[in-house]
Amino acid sequence: MAVTACQGLGFVVSLIGIAGIIAATCMDQWSTQDLYNNPVTAVFNYQGLWRSCVRESSGFTECRGYFTLLGLPAMLQAVRALMIVGIVLGAIGLLVSIFALKCIRIGSMEDSAKANMTLTSGIMFIVSGLCAIAGVSVFANMLVTNFWMSTANMYTGMGGMVQTVQTRYTFGAALFVGWVAGGLTLIGGVMMCIACRGLAPEETNYKAVSYHASGHSVAYKPGGFKASTGFGSNTKNKKIYDGGARTEDEVQSYPSKHDYV
């Protein structure tokens, strides 16, 4: 029962985590214009992995995709790759874990096979979570570096008279979503790995031994089954699973376009 709960919870946590990783990857607010200690602008700039956006004071928002592949910074490409690898591994892990769930019976799948699948999905979730955390952290590090570089030469003089204000960027909402989602996926993966230990059949498997007593025979079988009497009873042993109540995933609500300006 505890194993089923651990496995089920691990699956749900990983599912939420992977949904979060997908959401973070798609979000535009990986970096947002730093409004602190800056001239008050009538525009708000923010950037994602795939496009950059500008929201004007009227509320009009204009986004432009990064239509070049070679012209993009290597770090951005690396972050994209990490997030996509995380999503792919997570998706495969989810697929594998569905079949590995103890509460789902598929044919005559052995517990050992389920244990292996649970371990596989657990490892996939762990790697997926690590990819997401790494991707977000690399981007965050890139932002911090650029932030201090632009602070150092915030006002770059042009001809001594004219000044160009450099737009500084700080952490966007997607980074926090990514970190949390990566963490959840990682935790879910660990829970799956823990559940795998409980699912794995013990090394010493005792064969069923029949004890012949006078008048009737009773076959004792290991593994928690009730003993079945041998006199003409054709009753098959059935495992009764406590499926448990499964909570629905909460609907992911994306940030609405707030009236920032």
Partner: antibody, heavy 120, light 113 residues
Framework: EVQLVESGGGLVQPGGSLRLSCAAS????????IHWVRQAPGKGLEWVAY????????YYADTVKGRFTISRDNAKNSLYLQMNSLRAEDTAVYYC?????????????WGQGTTVTVSS | DIVMTQSPDSLAVSLGERATINCKSS????????????LAWYQQKPGQPPKLLIY???TRASGVPDRFSGSGSGTDFTLTISSLQAEDVAVYYC?????????FGQGTKLEIK
């Protein structure tokens, strides 16, 4: 047809107060940010204040900060400018102007203006 | 605050001739996020409110004749009237639309020579 009509101007003594109104029609008022801009006699244009469509963002020119208050009532399609502690240099024609939606923050429609005279 | 400086203060041009008004800002009005310039040009005829001519440094507002054109980027901008008409006599203002407080140039008075 987009229309902005200012009212509430008049003669006021220094230190006095005045409340300007701007009635909007011909467009969905709650979808647009609105500005107040003034023009002193024979002088150029001076931006005064801005209020966003949902009133969440308000900006003022340094010359009026702390003395003027911009507000709006989307239900009444109206914009207001409460002017307190008026000075002689506040004498001007006051225009309300709509911040265009996709005009790079430029003001695409202007009212005819209302005259405020601060004099003793 | 951003200082907008227009030149010349006044300009007299013959009908049908080209009129050019310059505007210089103390800081770049080019937004790095979308590489767009946030500068507008307004026309104000005597006794009338200003009218938007150009926004985004080079985009004509609706209903504006194509003889009006805007150019420039960063800190230097130009309004050009390719063939001056009698109804173009007015004061022209440039405006910073990127930084609050929004600031206007001092204006350029355009007259017919």
């Amino acid at each position: 047809e987009v229309q902005l009509v200012e009212s509430g101007g008049g003669l006021v003594q220094p230190g006095g107060s005045l409340r300007l109104s701007c009635a909007a029609s011909g467009f969905t008022f709650s979808d647009y940010g609105i500005h107040w801009v003034r023009q002193a006699p024979g002088k150029g244009l001076e931006w005064v204040a801005y209020i966003s469509r949902g009133s969440s963002t308000i900006y003022y020119a340094d010359t009026v900060k702390g003395r003027f208050t911009i507000s709006r009532d989307n239900a009444k399609n109206s914009l207001y400018l409460q002017m307190n502690s008026l000075r002689a240099e506040d004498t001007a024609v006051y225009y309300c102007a709509r911040g265009g939606y996709d005009t790079r923050n430029a003001m695409d429609y202007w009212g005819q203006g209302t005259t405020v005279t601060v004099s003793s | 605050d951003i200082v907008m400086t227009q030149s010349p203060d006044s300009l007299a041009v013959s009908l049908g001739e080209r009129a050019t008004i310059n505007c210089k800002s103390s800081q770049s009005l080019l937004n790095s996020g979308n590489q767009k310039n946030y500068l507008a040009w307004y026309q104000q005829k005597p006794g009338q409110p200003p009218k938007l001519l150009i926004y985004g440094a080079s985009t004509r507002a609706s209903g504006v004749p194509d003889r009006f054109s805007g150019s420039g980027s960063g800190t230097d901008f130009t309004l050009t009237i390719s063939s001056l008409q009698a109804e173009d006599v007015a004061v022209y203002y440039c405006q910073n639309d990127l930084y609050y407080p929004l600031t206007f140039g001092q204006g350029t008075k355009l007259e017919i020579k």
